[in-house]
Interface confidence: low
């Protein structure tokens, strides 16, 4: 669905709305659920595909075939109780360009290391005829005409303006859409020194029977291991689990990780004992430490070293 | 160039004892946790051991627990697996292997083989 | 203790697409790995996290993790991809374990 309240698109292609309660407008069909648009001039005037033959309207979606400068404005979709807004700003389009420079995303890449641009479009698919693959506005000749890819490991020469470009069919007319990814490569950048954040000792309120969650996060290298370590032996408390490692690149190249330690059915031999996460990596190790505490205790502990 | 390489493998009688080195190169060992993998003959793969990066992390199949250690030295870009109470089902080739912090086991030795029979 | 269950063998023809399942408790919950092994060779990483492939790896193998299964896909298959093939998945910090393999066969 689209989650994001603030978009710009350019002015000339294809772009739909879709709002979030989508599975939930399924299951009430019967439900009236309306699109409405207002701008400077128009407060909430609801739309319909008589309103515009660009419009078209489908379960979940507001469909704009293409979406013009007039179509900038606030979008509101509703459902009995539910409601969502948008806010859609068009941009004109670059004409002496293939790509609009507002519309453009960066990423930076090492030298080396693994360098990929595939050019997908999940939405249009089943409408997309051909794509093609232009760098610095000059097409480039892949194998593939429905998903052209480069994967590669990056070098200098790889920097610059890659875009992709759909084409699709429409009620017998030629549409595109164009994704453009400003690449830059740049020297290896050095380690850093991986961090757990949060402070280094934690007090946690529990009640017995109940479950806790311990969140450990670190600022780390892709190399690094983020663990954790509790017990004589770990993993031999079946009230105890470790969920899924999240990794998310920072824009510095660097991984923000996260790991959750799941302790079920809290018992009096989960309390007062260490819950330690460490990250490890060359530049050495850091290590947080948690302790559940029953909440009847809580006045013992200082209010600065309690989390909740 | 990466590469892991295996020994300290041989025939050893049961009860006895074996220690297996890994030998790395072409990266920095320091960063990366390690495991031990063996393969009985015929059999499928089935995981032994692991270490962090630094040393301060280790853990074991039930199988081996209290009989195997893992350690390592990272000044000398080394592995180790110290081997006692071997049982004739211990016999298998080791492969040792690296561990990247994304999931990734994308560097594996040759195998050594280790033979437990009287 | 936590199993992993493939089945021991598939056979495919060449050109066809070949599926290799691995089940367990929860399975989806975790990261599942693809190991190619081929006769006196040391095992090939070919998917980890679920889905991502290495590079190095061709494209027509991919993989997904959901449920209680995790799914080796070998699109186009070619007579090189005929190997034992073994799911794994991380259970706890470093901790993990393998399935007991499949052999591929391409007919």
């Known amino acids: 669905c689209t989650s994001r309240p603030h978009i710009t698109v350019v002015e000339g292609e294809p772009f739909y709305l879709k709002h979030c309660s989508c599975s939930l407008a399924h299951e009430i069909e019967t439900t009236t659920k309306s699109w409405y648009k207002s701008s400077g001039s128009q407060e909430h005037v609801e739309l319909n595909p008589r309103s515009s033959s660009r419009i078209a309207l489908h379960d979940c979606v507001l469909e704009f075939w293409p979406v013009e400068l007039n179509d900038t404005g606030s979008y509101f979709f509703q459902m009995k109780n539910y409601t969502q807004k948008w806010k859609l700003n068009v941009i004109r389009r670059n004409k002496h360009s293939c790509f609009t420079e507002r519309q453009v995303t960066s990423k930076i890449v090492e030298v080396k290391k693994f360098f990929q641009i595939t050019c997908e479009n999940s939405y249009y698919q089943t409408l997309v005829n051909s794509t093609s693959l232009y760098k610095n506005c000059k097409k480039l000749l892949l194998e593939n005409n429905k998903n052209p890819t480069i994967k590669k490991n990056a070098e200098f020469e790889d920097q610059g303006y890659y875009s992709c470009v759909h084409f699709l069919h429409h009620n017998g007319k030629l549409f595109n859409i164009t994704k453009t990814f400003n690449i830059t490569i740049v020297e290896d950048r050095s380690n850093i020194v991986p961090v757990l954040l949060g402070p280094k000792l934690n007090h946690v309120a529990v009640e017995l029977g109940k479950n806790v969650r311990l969140n450990c996060s670190a600022l780390l290298n892709e190399e690094d291991v983020i663990y954790w370590m509790f017990g004589e032996e770990n993993g031999s408390d079946p009230n105890i689990h470790e969920e899924k490692e999240m990794r998310i690149m920072t824009p510095e190249g660097k991984w923000h990780a996260s790991k959750v330690l799941r302790i079920e059915n809290i018992g009096e031999s989960n309390l007062n004992v260490l819950y330690n996460c460490t990250v490890a990596s060359t530049g050495g190790t850091d290590t947080k430490s948690f302790i559940l505490v029953r909440k009847a205790d809580m006045a013992d502990i200082p209010g600065h070293v309690f989390t909740r | 160039e990466v590469q892991l390489l295996e020994s300290g493998g041989g025939l050893v009688q049961p009860g006895g004892s074996l220690r297996l080195s890994c030998a790395a190169s072409?990266?920095?060992?320091?960063?990366?946790?390690m495991s031990w993998v063996r393969q009985a003959p015929g059999k499928g793969l089935e995981w032994v051991s692991a270490i962090s990066g630094s040393g301060g992390g280790t853990y074991y199949a039930d199988s081996v627990k209290g009989r195997f250690t893992i350690s390592r030295d990272n000044s000398k870009n080394t592995l180790y697996l110290q081997m006692n109470s071997l049982r004739a089902e211990d016999t298998a080739v080791y492969y040792c292997a690296r561990i990247r912090g994304d999931y990734r086991t994308d560097i594996w030795g040759q195998g050594t083989t280790v033979t437990v029979s009287s | 203790s936590y199993e992993l269950t493939q089945p021991p063998s598939v056979s495919v023809s060449p050109g066809q697409t070949a599926s290799i399942t691995c089940s367990g408790d929860k399975l989806g919950d975790k990261y599942a790995s693809w190991y190619q092994q081929k006769p006196g060779q040391s095992p090939v990483l070919v998917i980890y996290?679920?889905?991502n492939r290495p590079s190095g790896i061709p494209e027509r193998f991919s993989g997904s993790n959901s449920g209680n299964t995790a799914t080796l896909t070998i699109s186009g298959t070619q007579a090189m991809d005929e190997a034992d093939y073994y799911c794994?998945?991380?259970?706890?910090?470093?901790?993990?374990?393998f399935g007991g393999g499949t052999k591929l066969t391409v007919l």
């Open positions: 794994q998945a991380w259970t706890h910090s470093l901790s993990t374990l």
């Open positions: 996290q679920d889905s």
């Open positions: 072409g990266f920095t060992f320091s960063s990366y946790a």
